[in-house]
């Protein structure tokens, strides 16, 4: 069975949890001191306060903490105030600010570019496999298979627009019905949320930063998973998305519009096209069962081609094989017919690094995957550092207040909806929900944006990406217009339905609580973040895919018991926290289960042992490598050369859940500077405001 976070002998305390309104921080519960727990199941366990049962945060025993880990850190100012500076100091400060802004924009640029190249790398590594997923005939009859194909394909190509466009072309070619396409679109929505989760992994170096960043990223995942969990059965039963979108498409006489404006691509494309250029049509062709496409490379070689349509004479076995009776003749021996042939003449080669290497797609993809992840990680570290040095004191206060404060009463409820609109607008501008949510992740990590505020921004991002799809659909050629518009609208209404489910009533904002719970677990056991990623985005979809291929009977035979066990556990959990007296004594806690089934501790020991052999070698490579090491091996002394792990762990070695108090350093975002990883800046020259 999959590892569970610790489930102790916990009793609820209803008075201790106060749910904050939207945008507010939940009040930290008073946590009583806890005796050191041993792995002995029979040992007495001190009671701790728990959040309500509907929160995943209840699944982790947290020891005494100075502060609520979800409270935003205080970004204190260590520099000299502007008014106290002389003219020279002011000029120097101004240019420092300009310099920082340029650096920040530069790293942001390369961050977005690396996301684009990461997507290309994934397409090179798994694009053809992704295309083959689509050519499975069972998609038509099995919505669950459609869903996991949507997830897997989007994860493999790192782009929901690519998987959606494949679906559109399949629908317009009548290879797929709109009904069968809807679950795939839902899956694509889930798959696209992996990008910012990967970005969150890069912030693994600092526990509290990672806690927030990972929770901020996975709030997107949980929203999508929960929406699918509710809306897929509803759609299968009622076909409401199909019906609504069909009515809209039929009631309007749409004329072909113009392409959605590529605003961010205009800036990033000149750089990314120098690295690699892909022929994305190949994936679509594979999806549409084109045998020739399977041998084609995704790496674009020729960028300028001349296509000439000519008619050529070809021999046919018999007159029955002729194009038409009038286009049939004989030379006395063979039968001939005329066929239209598109002759493509290559004129100019593309200008990118891999154009003349003639490497296999997998090799190019692997190279780009490693490089883009390194650049992504490097840029992220630098963005966090620069933001940390800029967002201090007054600046931080203003930004945090602006972003996280609600409108005055009675309009406080409108704030979240404005955030949804902002998220949608920003995503529309950058033309990618992955880019927007990935940019949001480090900001959540360093404590500029709360998860409560990031949630509506993420929901808005989901809407924004569908409006882009609607615009792209309106620009489709005549034959694809109807199908692409209907699918884009299905995507849109699916996200709207999800928002209506999981946003308007604060009680229903389950994704926030689930993400915080996962953030807590991942901060304690950082390997669990990778485990979560693999399980939710690869293993579960692949298992469902495999079972679906085996047939409905196998899928139901395995699925029903699994779902039954999950429901049973959830019901038991609910009863344990709400009314434990109804349960027999043995079932009032999880102690009846072996430790490995109710705690991650034994699993942690296994993972630590497994990764132990890599510790010494990997850490000395570089800081980036060290971060990867810290992610895998929760080790206090793994880094001998670089101190990035060692120092962070030192103060917390004795604790069960090492979470650094935000006040420990002047500025949490540059705490590593204060710790000696980088020489601390001289406070005299430190510029705090732009």
């Amino acid at each position: 069975m999959a590892p569970w976070p610790e489930l102790g002998d916990a009793q609820p305390n209803p008075d201790k949890y106060l749910e904050g309104a939207a945008g507010q921080q939940p009040t930290a519960p008073d946590k009583s001191k806890e005796t050191n727990k041993t792995d002995n199941t029979e040992a007495p366990v001190t009671k701790i306060e728990l959040l309500p049962s509907y929160s995943t945060a209840t699944l982790i025993d947290e020891p005494t903490e100075v502060d609520d880990p979800w409270n935003l850190p205080t970004l204190q100012d260590s520099g000299i105030k502007w008014s106290e500076r002389d003219t020279k100091g002011k000029i120097l400060c101004f240019f420092q600010g300009i310099g920082r802004l340029i650096l920040l924009l530069g790293f942001l640029y390369f961050f977005v570019c690396s996301l684009d190249i990461l997507s290309s790398a994934f397409q090179l590594v798994g694009g053809k496999m992704a295309g083959q997923f689509f050519s499975n005939s069972s998609i038509m009859s099995n919505p669950l298979l459609g869903l996991v194909i949507g997830v897997l394909v989007t994860v493999l190509v790192q782009s929901s627009s690519t998987s959606t466009s494949i679906v559109v072309s399949m629908v317009s070619s009548s290879l797929l019905t709109v009904r069968a396409a809807i679950p795939i679109i839902m899956g694509a929505n889930i798959g696209t949320s992996i990008t910012n989760t990967i970005v969150a992994l890069m912030q693994v170096g600092d526990r509290s930063e990672f806690r927030r960043a990972f929770a901020g990223a996975t709030v997107h995942d949980f929203f999508n998973w929960l929406s699918v969990l509710v809306l897929l059965p509803v759609e299968v039963a009622t076909h409401y998305l199909e019906i609504i979108t069909q009515l809209i498409v039929e009631s309007f006489h749409f004329k072909n519009g113009e392409d959605a404006p590529d605003l961010l691509k205009v800036i990033t494309k000149p750089f990314t096209k120098l690295i690699v250029q892909l022929d994305k049509k190949v994936i679509s062709q594979i999806a549409m069962n084109d045998e020739k496409a399977k041998n084609k490379s995704l790496v674009k070689i020729w960028c300028k081609t001349f296509t000439n349509k000519t008619q050529i004479n070809v021999t046919v076995p018999s007159t029955a094989n002729c194009t038409s009776p009038s286009l049939c003749w004989t030379d006395g021996i063979q039968n001939w017919t005329m066929k239209n042939v598109t002759y493509k003449e290559n004129i100019a080669k593309c200008q990118h690094i891999f154009v003349n290497f003639h490497l296999p797609d997998l090799a190019v993809g692997t190279i780009l995957l490693i490089l883009s992840l390194l650049v992504l990680c490097g840029c992220l570290i630098m963005i966090v550092k620069i933001l940390g040095s800029v967002l201090k004191g007054q600046v931080a206060t203003v930004i945090k207040k602006t972003i996280n404060t609600d409108f005055p009463f009675p309009f406080a409820w409108l704030t979240g909806y404005l955030a949804i609109l902002v998220g949608a607008g920003m995503t529309f501008i950058v033309q990618s929900s992955s880019v927007f949510t990935s940019a949001l992740t480090p900001l959540i990590g360093i404590g500029v944006i709360t998860i409560e505020r990031a949630y509506p921004l993420t929901l808005g991002s989901n809407i924004g990406t569908t409006t882009t799809a609607i615009l792209a659909a309106l620009a489709s050629p005549g034959n694809a217009l109807r199908s692409s518009l209907q699918i884009a609208l299905c995507h849109f209404f699916f996200n709207i339905s999800g928002i209506l489910l999981w946003y308007p009533i604060p009680f229903t904002r389950l994704p926030i609580r689930m993400a915080k719970g996962l953030g807590n677990i991942s901060a304690k056991y950082r390997w669990f973040a990778v485990f979560y990623l693999i399980i939710f985005f690869f293993l579960i979809p692949l298992t469902v895919f495999g079972l679906s291929l085996a047939g409905w009977r196998v899928l139901v035979g395995v699925g029903v018991p699994v779902v039954f066990i999950i429901i049973l556990v959830l019901c038991l959990r609910l009863l344990q926290s709400r009314c434990p007296r109804v349960l027999p004594k043995k079932l009032q806690n999880w102690n009846f289960l072996p430790l490995w089934m109710r705690s991650l501790k034994p699993w942690d020991a296994v993972v630590s042992k497994f990764t132990g052999c890599f510790q010494m070698r990997c850490c000395c490579c570089c800081r980036v490598c060290c971060r990867a090491c810290c992610l895998l091996c929760d080790c206090p002394k793994c880094c001998r050369c670089s101190k990035c792990c060692e120092d962070l762990e030192e103060a917390q070695e004795g604790q069960d859940v090492p979470v650094k108090a935000p006040e420990t350093f002047d500025n949490i975002t540059i705490s590593r500077e204060a710790q000696g990883e980088v020489p601390a800046s001289d406070s005299k020259t430190e510029c705090t405001a732009l």
């Epitope: 004989t330 030379d331 006395g332």
Partner: antibody, heavy 120, light 107 residues
Framework: QVQLQQSGAEVVKPGASVKMSCKTS????????MHWVKQAPGQGREWIGA????????SYNQKFKGRATLTADKSTSTAYMELSSLRSEDTAVYYC?????????????WGQGTSVTVSS | DIQMTQSPSSLSASVGDRVTITCKAS??????VAWYQQKPGKVPKLLIY???TRHTGVPSRFSGSGSGTDFTLTISSLQPEDVATYYC?????????FGGGTKVEIK
Amino acid sequence: QVQLQQSGAEVVKPGASVKMSCKTSGYTFITYNMHWVKQAPGQGREWIGAIYPGSGDTSYNQKFKGRATLTADKSTSTAYMELSSLRSEDTAVYYCSISTIITTGAVDYWGQGTSVTVSS
Amino acid sequence: DIQMTQSPSSLSASVGDRVTITCKASQDVGTAVAWYQQKPGKVPKLLIYWTSTRHTGVPSRFSGSGSGTDFTLTISSLQPEDVATYYCQQYSRIPLTFGGGTKVEIK
């Protein structure tokens, strides 16, 4: 220039066989299809069949299938047609012809014809 | 087999006259039709193929038209050397078949 030289006139008895030749020059023998056409006096023309000397592939008019045999000798650039089980209605002039207009059955070079008379 | 019916079987016209010979196919042959000229005691000569394409060396007064089942050979201005028998032929299907011929004479 392209030339097709056919063998001389033949007088044969009913039931017998006749083998006529068509010697070519002025072009690559294996390039073009060789057609054989029958023209009976006072009647229309009939296509007997064709052979592609390059591969030896043949095609026949069902009416003549089994009685006509087309062959080609690449070494001498000569095409042959053998007509068996002759009857009086086989009395005609037989032409060999080639089509240099690739992929078409429009023949543009003809031999002078071989006259075959079937009489007892 | 595809039958090619030629009409008229013979015609007489003055020098300079416009002469039209028609050929009707029993089924659609597209444009796979050729026209031949055979002068008495001579071998046939290809005039037109693909319904309207003149063969090398054929005077421009000869033209062809039609498609499907109806085809026409036109001599825009009859000349004394045009006295001959004209045959149409289809090469759309095996066996290749010829029309019965049209004998053209000068009045």
